[in-house]
Interface confidence: low
Amino acid sequence: SGVFQLQLQEFINERGVLASGRPCEPGCRTFFRVCLKHFQAVVSPGPCTFGTVSTPVLGTNSFAVRDDSSGGGRNPLQLPFNFTWPGTFSLIIEAWHAPGDDLRPEALPPDALISKIAIQGSLAVGQNWLLDEQTSTLTRLRYSYRVICSDNYYGDNCSRLCKKRNDHFGHYVCQPDGNLSCLPGWTGEYCQQPICLSGCHEQNGYCSKPAECLCRPGWQGRLCNECIPHNGCRHGTCSTPWQCTCDEGWGGLFCDQDLNYCTHHSPCKNGATCSNSGQRSYTCTCRPGYTGVDCELELSECDSNPCRNGGSCKDQEDGYHCLCPPGYYGLHCEHSTLSCADSPCFNGGSCRERNQGANYACECPPNFTGSNCEKKVDRCTSNPCANGGQCLNRGPSRMCRCRPGFTGTYCELHVSDCARNPCAHGGTCHDLENGLMCTCPAGFSGRRCEVRTSIDACASSPCFNRATCYTDLSTDTFVCNCPYGFVGSRCEFPVGLPPSFPW
């Protein structure tokens, strides 16, 4: 069950004429007849199988149609149907001229038709309006349409009946597809099953209405997750109903017998440790200096002769104290001290006894330190070398290794970089803050004028017979070093032939 809705929006008949071409007098008082039927490939006359509807006169010639759904429900036009929507349709919209007030078909002349449009197609159920516009030679009609389900009908074809309810038989509303949607607090196929209080134990609790948690026998608590122990259980708990599992220190059928005498009565004295050994039974483990069943009797701690190596014992309020003889120390005089007889001084240090030999002191030679002269003196720790010099320990003294350009005991003196004549081939040296610069004579270049820039005499390959060519930099000439069997300034003559016969 559903409704085909047609919303007429605008009709244009600018010349105010009928379909026959004849003008309306005084203007075309226009109303519409709508026919909705099953799908036809070619829309033909015949019964309007899905329904018909007519409008009153909506305007003259050209006009916009007001959305009047609130006041009387005339626009959109309603074409209800009581069957499963097939998804296809044919629609005929006729515009008629009403000369008088009687709009019945039989009361109108047949030529009162202004225009007729026929469309067909697919149309799914939904809230979306489909907009369309149909134009003929003289008129234009703009409209939109849709199919929606009637109340309580749902699904793609409006075939699914669903009526919301909230009673013993169900608590639900309907989804757009017609499926049930349970009201808050309800579940199950027909939403008849209440959802218990969140956390209510699945097995031990139940409910007859939402957010409730009723306990089954033997269980208690807000969420029915606490068991009820056996009646008369005194100092015990349960993990299942009617159980009595005794707390620590308690026994008996109802956990009413005291097994933890230590905790409940504290019988041990003077900080002793108490251990339970049965009902009303305990054992005290005494701290040193105490005895008795409850450690109530005090012992003298010196009775056990705790001091060694001839130390004498003195009783004190919180224990005892050992007075050690010379050469021994520690809580029980168990440690012996060193004396000069043990040669404790290293690196040639000399030993001096103190306090009648009870202890000693070492006098260290130069370069060594420490209570036993075991540490070598490092004279470089104060970083005495300036200008990035490296400090080196050399026996009893130290020395600085200076970076280039510095001298002096502590590298504190700046050396003239030009003092060692670094510029070659007569170059002029200039001292700069961070080094030097050479001004080179003609024919030389490079940082130290070491590169000869005049023409290389060997460049023209003057030597013959695979001789090796050398440039004489002082004279700017070449020298040929001849291979075996050749002579001449260019090695041009073979040995044994006169010079007048060059090879």
Epitope: Q7, Q9, D67, Q127, N128, W129, L130, L131, S144
Partner: nanobody
């Protein structure tokens, strides 16, 4: 007659924002679902976002989810698209349209389109 007029496009840098508007006239705007569609140079139309007639339900293409927000003001007959965190691939002509039907991912057919507004995102 139905008219849809888009505005608010322009040139913006990557990461920037724009707000598009679509002024509707010639039909009962509040009765219709509305949609934004875009067409990049040399490509077919791509559905961007849609909103139901009352404005309570909104839908977005995966490519714009979390960056674009569709809204409408039925009293002013205007549809909006707020575009944040724009990317160069958002460059296109943006159209507002009345959807004619829905496919699995969104509207796939449109009854009416506007003339469009150009959005260019530079990197």
């Amino acid at each position: 007659e139905v008219q849809l007029v888009e505005s608010g496009g322009g040139l913006v840098q990557s990461g920037g924002s724009l707000r598009l508007s679509c002024a509707a006239s010639g039909f009962t705007f509040g009765s219709y679902d509305m949609s934004w569609v875009r067409q990049a140079p040399g490509k077919g139309p791509e559905w961007v976002s849609a909103i139901n007639s009352g404005g309570g339900s909104t839908y977005y293409a995966d490519s714009v989810k979390g960056r674009f927000t569709i809204s409408r003001d039925n009293a002013k007959n205007t549809l909006y698209l707020q575009m944040n965190s724009l990317k160069p691939e958002d460059t296109a002509v943006y159209y507002c349209a009345i959807p004619r039907g829905w496919g699995p991912t969104g509207p796939h057919e449109y009854a009416y389109w506007g003339q469009g507004t150009q959005v260019t995102v530079s990197s």
